[in-house]
């Protein structure tokens, strides 16, 4: 089978959502966990993660082969403490298979804004607290 993991981010007002999306087949969901780590280059695991989620066993409909499971980690107000390197990962507790997404970073600037870099869908996102929009 083929399991794909991607990272993305979205902003809602002052909130920043960090999103890990895993695409997988129904039969691959059993025992799989997706999780988000911060500043853990080597030992990212569900136990050391910010948040974890079991993969969906059911896509909700029957006419599809693949399921997307989405872990969302919400930062209500980004502060300098949130600066760092993040990574979406997935692990099977049955087979031991481990997936690692690309590293991405949050950089809090002196002006009170922050940038999110390293995301594959959008290579560089910059967020402004003051305006509450992507720039």
């Amino acid at each position: 089978g083929c399991i794909n993991i991607t990272s993305s981010a979205s902003q809602e007002g002052t909130r920043l959502n960090l999103i890990c999306t895993v695409w997988h087949k129904k039969e691959e969901a059993e025992g799989f966990v997706v999780f988000l780590c911060k500043d853990r280059s080597g030992d990212c695991s569900p136990e050391t993660s910010l948040k974890q989620l079991r993969l969906k066993r059911d896509p909700g409909i029957d006419g599809v082969g693949e399921i997307s499971s989405q872990l969302m980690f919400t930062i209500s107000q980004v502060t300098p403490l949130h600066s760092g390197t993040y990574q979406c990962c997935a692990r099977s507790q049955k087979s031991g298979i481990r997936l690692q997404g690309h590293f991405f970073s949050i950089l809090f600037t002196e002006t009170g804004n922050y940038t999110v870099t390293g995301l594959k869908q959008r290579q560089h996102l910059e967020f402004s607290h003051n305006e509450g929009t992507l720039s």
Partner: antibody, heavy 121, light 107 residues
Framework: QVQLVQSGAEVKKPGASVKVSCKAS????????MQWIRQAPGQGLEWIGA????????RYTQKFRGRATLTADKSTSTAYMELSSLRSEDTAVYYC??????????????WGQGTTLTVSS | EIVLTQSPATLSLSPGERATLSCRAS??????LHWYQQKPGQAPRLLIK???QSISGIPARFSGSGSGTDFTLTISSLEPEDFAVYFC?????????FGGGTKVEIK
């Protein structure tokens, strides 16, 4: 045993909002899609939407998108359906129902008892 | 959106007779169709899953058939408690949809 217990009957004025709850027990709440279906007096069944409590993935039929909001509280195994901008045509019995696991059951195998909503000025 | 059309709208039969209910989908849905029974004042009850698969606790007189766009629910010999409304529902794609229902009434 699996049980879905819904909140009591509601009477609302046009333009108001209502929030119906559905408390689940007897199974792992986060592993099953919860459906919301309504039935106007003397009419058929109308699917509103569904939510997967495991990751809060919610799907809606076009008619209710933007007016219905489905949420789930894993800590209490309770699903909610909020309907805003109520009109008289929303008078109906609202059901929550669990979708059985795909390829095993697939249909809605357990249903709540229904919540009657009356919208009247 | 997949539209499910049930026919007839009403079926008038006597106890002991055979009931044949039809559900037609606007596009192919494989076997992703389920049947429900609803009695007045009650929530629907799942009768048949995936077009033809039986459900535990449902009498053997209820059977389903069909695939693609045409489906049938058959009640081999009607019992007094079978007079009710029957709905089909597809789980092939979003949004999930129901048929308009067939009322089986006593002749």
């Amino acid at each position: 045993q699996v049980q879905l217990v819904q909140s009591g009957a509601e009477v609302k004025k046009p333009g108001a909002s209502v929030k119906v709850s559905c408390k689940a027990s007897g199974y792992t709440f986060s592993d099953y899609w919860m459906q919301w279906i309504r039935q106007a007096p003397g009419q058929g069944l109308e699917w509103i939407g569904a939510i997967y409590p495991g990751d809060d993935d919610a799907r809606y039929t076009q008619k209710f998108r933007g007016r219905a909001t489905l949420t789930a509280d894993k800590s209490t195994s309770t699903a909610y359906m909020e309907l805003s901008s109520l009109r008289s045509e929303d008078t109906a019995v609202y059901y929550c129902a669990r979708r059985g696991i795909a390829a095993v059951v697939g249909g809605f195998d357990y249903w709540g008892q229904g919540t009657t909503l009356t919208v009247s000025s | 959106e997949i539209v499910l059309t049930q026919s007839p709208a009403t079926l008038s039969l006597s106890p002991g007779e055979r009931a044949t209910l039809s559900c037609r989908a606007s596009q192919s849905i494989s076997n992703h169709l389920h049947w429900y029974q609803q009695k007045p004042g009650q929530a629907p009850r799942l009768l048949i899953k995936y077009a033809s698969q039986s459900i535990s606790g449902i009498p053997a007189r209820f059977s389903g058939s069909g695939s693609g766009t045409d489906f049938t629910l058959t009640i081999s010999s009607l019992e007094p408690e079978d007079f009710a409304v029957y709905f089909c529902q597809q789980s092939n794609s979003w949004p999930l949809t129901f048929g308009g229902g067939t009322k089986v009434e006593i002749k």
